[in-house]
């Protein structure tokens, strides 16, 4: 049903869904702090632009009685229940921030007449791609997939002279929300990744993974998995690994690899870690004091969601345009705005662009070193270390199929 929006006459409200089921187990208080910090910045920016308006946030909490799994499994109904609550209260803002779970975002988008923009910190799955009024401020699965295909095909780097066309994907069903959808995208038979690879098999059992490490008859030397180093260690332990195995560990929202005192454990020597470039330190900000490094990206996405709204509000007000229009709802894409941590770029479909960083463990220093960067906005790789001190033979990445000659 059509809900009137609190979004005119100099008063602009943001509806923030505070869902019990979330992509990251973050206390709602921390997200509230992030939103409030964002509001302060937006008010300052609007004031500096000579726009004398009021911007507030309304936090919509679910009762948590029915949907209490805490993860995203029961988020579909929770999202719709919250929308019903908004509808009953006749209290909708200019923009909806949240939800973060792919299930709930997909369902809410499907089941509502979306004449307002929706900003999500999460919604990683392919089912949330190409949604006209949805903006995603954390790297979605599509971006990961494009990197992997680009990297697989690359054969003109000093350290990667073979194109790859095969892979194993380890996916045991216990993954975090981001990893679940990243791996889900790689598994999907109709996805770009599957389409571009000649061979791909999903390993679902620990034993399957462990057996592949030394299996002479394996069909690929490359294994993709998602999680942190500890996750890998639980699985791999100190088992021997064939010398031409390459494990790609996707761990996007973890900037601990860049900390000065971090030493790579020995079991990481056959591993390339894919992560995001580290942001400027957020440690001094009031909202992030209680956050672990892996949670900062989530809270930061909420904060940046507020700043994005402020950016669009400023543009529309300066141009004398109405906020409660489809034009406003569809405008949150193909732009760069001033985020909390520097410029943030959104692609044509409202998805955040970022710099992914591929790290390796130096056999000399036992430190994580940057091998290359990948700009998701232009789909281009930039090699950083041309002479990496790899564990692999000749300091080059092996072929993906043992015994196959140059491609």
């Amino acid at each position: 049903s059509q809900v009137s929006q609190n979004c005119h006459n100099g008063s602009y409200e943001i509806s923030v869904l505070m869902m019990g089921n979330s992509a990251f187990a973050e206390p709602l208080k921390n997200l509230e702090d992030a939103v409030n910090e964002g509001l302060e910045i937006v008010r300052g920016r609007l004031q500096n632009a000579g726009l004398n308006v009021t911007v507030n946030a309304t936090f919509m909490y679910s009762d948590g009685l029915i949907h209490n799994s805490g993860d995203c499994r029961s988020s579909t109904c929770e999202g719709l229940d919250l929308l019903r609550k908004i509808s009953n209260a006749q209290r909708m803002g200019c923009v909806l921030i949240g939800p973060s779970c792919t299930y709930s975002t997909f369902q809410m988008y499907l089941d509502t007449e979306l004449s307002y923009p929706m900003i999500s910190a999460g919604s990683f799955g392919l089912s949330c791609d190409y949604k006209e009024t949805l903006t995603r401020l954390m790297s979605p699965a599509r971006k990961l997939m494009y990197f992997l295909v680009n990297f697989w095909k690359t054969n003109d780097l000093p350290f990667k002279t073979y194109s790859w066309s095969t892979s194993y994907v380890y996916k045991n069903g216990t993954e975090t929300e981001d990893c679940f959808w990243y791996l889900n995208a790689l598994e999907a038979s109709v996805s770009y990744f599957s389409h571009e690879l000649g061979f791909k098999v999903v390993l679902r059992q620990d034993k399957e993974f462990q057996d592949i490490l030394m299996d002479h008859n394996r069909k690929s030397n490359v294994i993709i998995m998602c999680g942190g180093p500890e996750f890998l260690y639980k699985l791999k332990g100190d088992r021997a690994v064939a010398e031409d195995i390459v494990i790609i560990l996707v761990d996007l929202f973890n900037d601990q690899y860049f900390e000065d005192n971090v030493t790579a454990p020995d079991y990481m020597k056959n591993v390339l870690v894919l992560t995001l470039s580290p942001g400027n330190s957020l440690l001094n900000s009031s909202f992030s004091r209680n956050l672990s490094p892996t949670k900062r990206d989530f809270a930061l996405a909420y904060l940046n969601g507020i700043l994005l709204f402020g950016h669009m509000l400023k543009i529309f007000l300066e141009n004398g345009e109405n906020i409660t229009t489809p034009k406003f709802a569809h405008a949150f894409r193909n732009l760069t705005f001033e985020g909390y941590d520097g410029p943030v770029t959104l692609d044509d479909w409202g998805d955040v662009d970022s710099t992914m960083v591929l790290l390796y463990t130096s056999v000399d220093t036992k430190k994580y070193k940057v091998l290359l960067t990948y700009d998701t906005h232009v789909n281009k790789t930039y090699p950083v270390d041309m002479s990496p001190t790899f564990t692999w033979k000749n300091s080059k990445l092996p072929n993906d199929i043992t015994g196959r000659g140059p491609q």
């Epitope: 470039s277 520097g342 410029p343 710099t355 960067t373 700009d375 930039y382 090699p383 950083v384 041309m386």
Partner: antibody, heavy 118, light 110 residues
Framework: EVQLVQPGAEVKKPGSSVKVSCKAS????????ISWVRQAPGQGLEWMGR????????NYAQKFQGRVTITADKSTSTAYMELSSLRSEDTAVYFC???????????WGQGTLVTVSS | QSELTQPASVSGSPGQSITISCTGT?????????VSWYQQHPGKVPKLMIH???HRPSGVSNRFSGSRSGNTASLTISGLQAEDEADYFC??????????FGTGTKVTVL
């Protein structure tokens, strides 16, 4: 399309330092490198060093090691090149340029003429 | 290696083809695909003409082509035109994780 904007000119005394800025407008510094290249009057191009702003990783030409410092501010999309202990031979146009691939500079700033004179 | 070696000048008549060489070592030109060519008109900013030995950026005329043999890279300009008169510089990535430019070649259209 990104453009690199540099100040027009600087006049410095021998022994002093100069800090030249290079701001990306119409885009961000992104994940590429920013190189600094100088050209003395009537001379060829000379590579001084580079930075990958998103990571803060720098490399310097041996000739300038210890005398040049390249930095970047991601939040303002600005790169900086500081050259110390200036001498008259440092009089040159200083360009910043974006590396879209290593040693492949596809976007250049207009250049800053630094004159070192007593 | 402080600089890559280029001929000081090359000339040709309109419509002709000319080739500029750029000689280095196996630690730079011969060792990596990262060899580029730049055109610079007097008082202007250098313009990227070729990257990765032989790749032309969009917007660059297909009269410009690049190649490499051993430690020498070459830039060929076919169908020489008056506006091609400029200085040309090669550059390469080096094994010391640096870049190096060539000495520069002045192209004159007769």
């Amino acid at each position: 399309e990104v453009q690199l904007v540099q100040p027009g000119a600087e006049v410095k005394k021998p022994g002093s330092s100069v800090k030249v800025s290079c701001k990306a407008s119409g885009g961000t510094l992104s994940s590429y490198a920013i190189s600094w290249v100088r050209q003395a009057p009537g001379q060829g191009l000379e590579w001084m060093g580079r930075i990958i702003p998103i990571l803060g990783i720098t490399n310097y030409a041996q000739k300038f090691q210890g005398r040049v410092t390249i930095t970047a501010d991601k939040s303002t999309s600005t790169a900086y090149m500081e050259l110390s202990s200036l001498r008259s031979e440092d009089t040159a146009v200083y360009f910043c340029a974006r590396d879209q691939r290593p040693a492949s500079m596809d976007v250049w700033g207009q250049g800053t003429l630094v004159t070192v004179s007593s | 290696q402080s600089e890559l070696t280029q001929p000081a000048s090359v000339s040709g008549s309109p419509g002709q083809s000319i080739t500029i060489s750029c000689t280095g070592t196996s630690s730079d030109v011969g060792g990596y695909i990262y060899v580029s060519w730049y055109q610079q008109h007097p008082g202007k900013v250098p313009k990227l003409m070729i990257h990765d030995v032989s790749h032309r950026p969009s917007g660059v005329s297909n009269r410009f082509s690049g190649s490499r043999s051993g430690n020498t890279a070459s830039l060929t300009i076919s169908g020489l035109q008056a506006e091609d008169e400029a200085d040309y510089f090669c550059s390469s990535y080096t094994s010391s994780n640096n870049y190096v430019f060539g000495t520069g070649t002045k192209v004159t259209v007769l």
